[in-house]
């Protein structure tokens, strides 16, 4: 289990407890409710695909 306050993830990634691995912050526009997005520096700008249902 990931210790609080530590991150094994490279820049641009954040730890996902749900998926038990580092995940790319770039995926947060498409999956904004993912647990790891809370660990990304800022909410990245949306891209077009967010407009799809």
């Amino acid at each position: 289990e990931q210790a609080p306050g530590t991150s094994p993830c490279s820049s641009g990634s954040s730890w996902s407890a749900d998926l038990d691995k580092c995940m790319d912050c770039a995926s947060c526009p498409a999956r904004p409710h993912s647990d790891f997005c809370l660990g990304c520096a800022a909410a990245p700008p949306a891209h077009f695909r967010l407009l799809w249902p």
């Epitope: 995926s27 700008p45 891209h47």
Partner: antibody, heavy 119, light 111 residues
């Protein structure tokens, strides 16, 4: 280890139907969108359909070439995704792959199942 | 739909040298933060395999001799130094919008 096993391909006549299946293991299936992608010498790699999560009400999206003819579905209890293909045409002849994506990347690919539409 | 044009269609590179493959998109697939472009490798007789995501990030287990760069509409895959096992067809793919589309592929032969 991630495993994806496609099945259900074969030879079918134009206008016929076929249902492809893909059984997945080695990753949290319920958290991943699932895609079908096909590959033919004529058209190369071509995305066909995507199905999202239960929390997205299993939203589906299709390529124009698949709309109205193909239906993607999933069974989370079986870690499986399906592609029902109706009114098949010669141009649907291809190898069909299933692939999970968390958001943008097709992280893993199965070995594919071959579909031939010919009389 | 976004059209991805790869060049060259094929290339032959001597062992240990550099291979450079281009992918041009018909419209931008980048925000100020990220580029939504991926690269895949397909060895003969095998399924595609993810190499690079978000234009420049290597997938886990991919050797460091692979690198990706670019933003907006112009993207590049570099392999240096090339090895025998790099003989394959390489595809770019965008995830900016639906439908996802792929480039036509670049076949790499090692001399």
């Amino acid at each position: 280890e991630v495993k994806l096993g496609e099945s259900g391909g074969g030879l079918v006549q134009p206008g016929g139907s076929m249902k492809l299946s893909c059984v997945a293991s080695g990753f949290p299936f319920t958290k991943y969108w699932m895609n079908w992608v096909r590959q033919s010498p004529e058209k190369g790699l071509e995305w066909v359909a995507e199905i999202r999560l239960k929390s997205d009400n299993y939203a589906t999206h299709y390529a124009e070439s698949a709309k109205g003819r193909f239906t993607i579905s999933r069974d989370d209890s079986r870690s499986s995704v399906y592609l029902q293909m109706n009114n098949l045409r010669a141009e649907d002849t291809a190898i069909y792959y299933c692939s999970p994506t968390y958001a943008d990347t097709m992280d893993y690919w199965g070995q594919g199942t071959s579909v031939t539409v010919s009389s | 739909d976004i059209v991805l044009t790869q060049s060259p269609a094929s290339l032959a590179v001597s062992l240990g040298q550099r291979a450079t493959i281009s992918c041009k998109a018909s419209q931008s697939v980048s925000t100020s933060t990220y580029s939504y472009m991926q690269w895949y490798q397909q060895r003969p007789g095998q399924s595609p395999k993810l190499l690079i995501k978000y234009a420049s990030k290597l997938d886990s287990g991919v050797p460091a001799r692979f690198s990706g760069s670019g933003s907006g509409t112009d993207f590049t895959l570099n392999i240096h130094p090339v090895e025998e096992e790099d003989t394959a067809t390489y595809y770019c793919q965008h995830s900016w919008e639906l439908p996802y589309t792929f480039g036509g592929g670049t076949r790499l032969e090692i001399k």
